[in-house]
């Protein structure tokens, strides 16, 4: 097989015919050294998935349910290109499965038992698989056959295409359960009509169904959405209140050696030449031989799926939960309203050791999961492999953009017993230099810089945001002669100063000696000219407070702060000499786990928090000998957020604006994936 050939998998004679036409037309418009198409015919989409996994084909386009099959071992395929619908300016690659109710009704998602339900059709995504998958563990046992369990859960339903003889309750609202538009309650519009007519109490449809059926906002305002957290929202808040986000139609490839760049190059060229309204002789998104061949006829084009986005992230936690429940039919033994152990995400093996000790002391209420970077941890929380972790504000922003929510804040200044209920203002982000140097904020160009990590508040977002507004470009590695900013490209000058050791050089975790607040300060002590840290870093690592060899003889008076007005001040005066106020670190979790995480952590800190005085013979949650493992070592307590329970409210408008501006310079693959 030539290196630049993409073997497309076709699942019918008609698809194979279109594939050959696709191949021939691409040959006529692409240079001989460009990508080419080859066609492989298989009997089904599942056979195509297996063929790609076995390297007998390279690509196929799949519906969401099949993307799930493709992702499962041993297939291990990943999404590489998404079809989009709507306009190029506002491309839609996903739809949202929602539960619609009338505003004047008064029940929540956890009170659906005994209500009347309207569905688009048996086995369909938004109308059946997702809602029934998510409700699966609430269905009465035995849960097989599924239709019987659903019939016994609701007091009456309309499920088009169901067997009305065996399951009459499923056809109670639409006698016969007709499987076509002859049934007035069939499909999306039909299920909505079933609700509108008052036949049912809830309709399981797509987010767009309401807008397509009710052009008038006043009419739409008579309806609401049921959210998974047992609240309701208006119908236009579907992005924050849905059962699952469902990808429409996706090209998949192998996770390793999958030719994703070649596939994108091919499809990008194909949409340029043969996309909507581009060519008379061959159309990518239609065919005389049949409907939806190779690609959906309704598609308007393709978008490249960000490389960080694997199938779990693409399909989303809710969708995977729903499909897994339906397929595997397994439910936790514990009742769903009881808190299961919380899986904490630990960064690399140093945090993992502390987490393990916590787990032993918590009597198993805490479990541990590891990842090599903060972004990998956030991804694990998103997909349910982990539940929670404490993050710097810069990562609270990324986690928030990825759908996680802040749960508790680390407090550093408020003594107990008021600590738990106090909202602190934050800490100061400062620039530290040696007293012996002549540096000021205005002559940092060409100097050696030390950063906690890329994407963190005091070490990156605040100083680089201020720098960006001064230099108007993102080439920070050219502004400083060299530096250590863990998480930078390995060949960047901002990795040159890092200490490693080798395979971990410049990695954004504790294996890199210059990572974090203490690491950035160490970088200044040993190699750098300026360190961007929190205001407490110098006092915490001088005067013998840090016993490590590099720090034990350091004196606080040998360091000063740079002020934005060009002056310098003592490290004792951060309130009058700082770059900005930074939001405290905060614990984040998935929305569905937030309450359990909060309850458990408040309980854990009562046992292992700052009230424990002897950490040499007791486990201390907020202690790791200046290394800030799992939590900052100067944490006094974890505090309730009260109404600051979204990332925007928690971080504050000013900080969110600053980080959003800095996104022009973003090197965050996760953020790119979460905003796809």
């Amino acid at each position: 097989v030539p290196e630049k050939s993409v073997r497309w998998c076709a699942v019918s004679e008609h698809e194979a015919t279109k594939c050959q036409s696709f191949r021939d037309h691409m040959k006529s418009v692409l240079p001989s050294n460009g990508p080419s198409v080859a066609c492989v015919k298989k009997a089904s989409h599942l056979d195509c998935i297996r063929a790609i996994a076995a390297n007998e084909a390279d690509a196929v386009t799949l519906d969401a349910g099949l993307v799930y099959d493709a992702y499962l071992a041993p297939n291990n395929l990943k999404p590489v290109v998404a079809e989009f619908y709507g306009s190029k300016e506002d491309p839609q690659t996903f739809y949202y499965a929602v539960a619609v109710v009338k505003k004047d009704s008064d029940f929540q998602m956890n009170q659906l038992r005994g209500r009347k339900s309207c569905h688009t059709g048996l086995g369909r995504s938004a109308g059946w698989n997702i809602p029934i998958g998510l409700l699966y563990c609430d269905l009465p046992e035995p849960r097989k056959p599924l239709e019987k369990a659903v019939a016994n859960f609701f007091s009456g339903s309309c499920v088009p295409c169901a067997d009305g003889t065996d399951f009459p309750q499923l056809c109670q609202l639409c006698p016969g359960c007709g499987c076509s538009t002859l049934n007035q309650y069939f499909s999306y519009s039909g299920a909505f009509k079933c609700l509108k007519d008052g036949a049912g109490d809830v309709a399981f449809v797509k987010h767009s169904t309401i807008f397509e059926n009710l052009a008038n906002k006043a009419d739409r305002d008579q309806y609401e959405l049921l959210c998974l957290d047992n609240t309701r929202k208006s119908v236009d808040e579907y992005k924050d209140c849905h059962l699952a986000r469902v990808p429409s139609h996706t090209v998949v490839a192998r996770s390793v050696g999958g030719k994703e760049d070649l596939i994108w190059e091919l499809l990008n060229q194909a949409q340029e030449h043969f996309g909507k309204d581009k060519s008379k002789e061959f159309q990518l998104f239609s065919s005389p031989h049949g409907k939806d061949l190779l690609f959906k006829d309704s598609a308007h084009g393709f978008l490249k799926v960000p490389p960080r986005m694997d199938a779990k992230m693409y399909l989303g936690y809710e969708y995977i939960t729903a499909i897994r429940n339906l397929r595997e039919g397994t439910c936790p033994e514990a009742p769903t309203d009881e808190c299961k152990p919380v899986k904490w995400c630990a960064l690399s093996h140093h945090e993992r050791l502390k987490c393990d000790e916590w787990s032993v002391n918590s009597a198993g209420k805490i479990e541990c999961e590891s990842a090599e970077t903060t972004e990998d941890c956030i991804a694990k929380i998103m997909n349910g492999e982990a539940d929670a972790m404490s993050l710097d504000g810069g990562f609270v922003y990324i986690a928030g953009m990825c759908g996680l929510v802040p749960v508790l804040a680390e407090n550093y200044n408020t003594p107990n017993p008021n600590c738990e209920n106090t909202a602190e203002e934050g800490y100061f982000a400062v620039a530290v230099v040696k007293s012996s140097s002549d540096l000021t904020w205005d002559n940092l160009k060409g100097k050696k810089s030390c950063h906690t990590a890329v994407g963190r508040t005091a070490g990156w977002n605040i100083p680089m945001g201020l720098l960006y507004s001064k230099i108007n470009h993102c080439r920070f590695d050219e502004f400083f002669s060299e530096g250590c900013a863990p998480g930078s490209e390995k060949n960047s000058s901002l990795c040159k100063l890092c200490m490693g050791p080798s395979p971990n050089l410049c990695e954004p975790n504790n294996k890199e000696g210059y990572y974090g607040y203490t690491g950035a300060f160490r970088c200044l002590v040993e190699k750098g000219d300026v360190a961007f840290v929190k205001h407490q870093t110098v006092p915490q690592n001088t005067g013998g407070k840090n016993p490590d060899a590099w720090a034990k003889n350091l004196k606080e008076e040998d360091y000063e702060l740079l002020c934005l007005d060009g002056s310098r001040k003592s490290v004792q005066e951060p309130a009058n000499c700082h770059l900005a106020r930074a939001p405290n670190h905060a614990v984040v979790a998935r929305k569905d786990k937030a309450d359990c995480v909060q309850t458990l952590l408040l309980d854990q800190q009562r046992m292992f928090g700052s009230s424990v005085t002897d950490c040499s013979s007791n486990f201390c949650l907020f202690e790791s000998k200046t290394k800030d493992l799992l939590f900052r070592d100067d944490t006094v307590c974890l505090a309730k957020l009260h109404d600051r329970n979204t990332y925007e409210k928690y971080l504050g408008e000013e900080y969110v604006k600053a980080v959003t501006n800095l996104r022009k310079c973003s090197t965050s693959p996760l953020l790119e994936a979460c905003t796809f």
Epitope: H350, E351, L353, K354, E357, V360, N361, A363, N510, S616, S617, N618, F619, S624, K625, K627, L629
Partner: nanobody
Framework: QVQLVESGGGLVQPGGSLRLSCAAS????????MAWYRQAPGQQRELVAG???????KYADSVKGRFTISRDNAKNTLYLQMNSLKPEDTAVYYC???????????WGQGTQVTVSS
């Protein structure tokens, strides 16, 4: 800080048993948490079992019901009783008391356990 020395490993058939010991050079009475870890070739080191001063224990899912951790403060020794051994239990086993902080790599020699027929 006490020094810890592991012993008791060896070659055993699937289904067999071993008892690992970890002898401390000083008193372990005031040590809060002690634990056994293991590392198989090419794998990360993982927690097998842990025990607190008060006797609270935690086990990895893969060993629950087969392994038992205990400590004898009078003998300054930590134990791991391993029953119904499986080939996947093959690894070097280490004990720790977490007392050196989490940052330094402070593992001892460990003791090799090989489960094979």
């Amino acid at each position: 800080q006490v020094q810890l020395v592991e012993s008791g490993g060896g070659l055993v058939q699937p289904g067999g048993s071993l008892r690992l010991s970890c002898a401390a050079s000083g008193s372990i009475a005031s040590i809060n948490t002690m634990a056994w870890y293991r590392q198989a070739p090419g794998q990360q080191r993982e927690l097998v079992a842990g025990i607190t001063r008060g006797g609270s224990t935690k086990y990895a899912d893969s060993v629950k019901g087969r392994f038992t951790i205990s400590r004898d403060n009078a003998k300054n020794t930590l134990y791991l009783q391993m029953n119904s051994l499986k080939p996947e239990d093959t690894a070097v086993y280490y004990c720790t008391d977490y007392s050196r902080g989490y940052y330094q790599d402070y593992w001892g020699q460990g003791t090799q356990v090989t489960v094979s027929s």
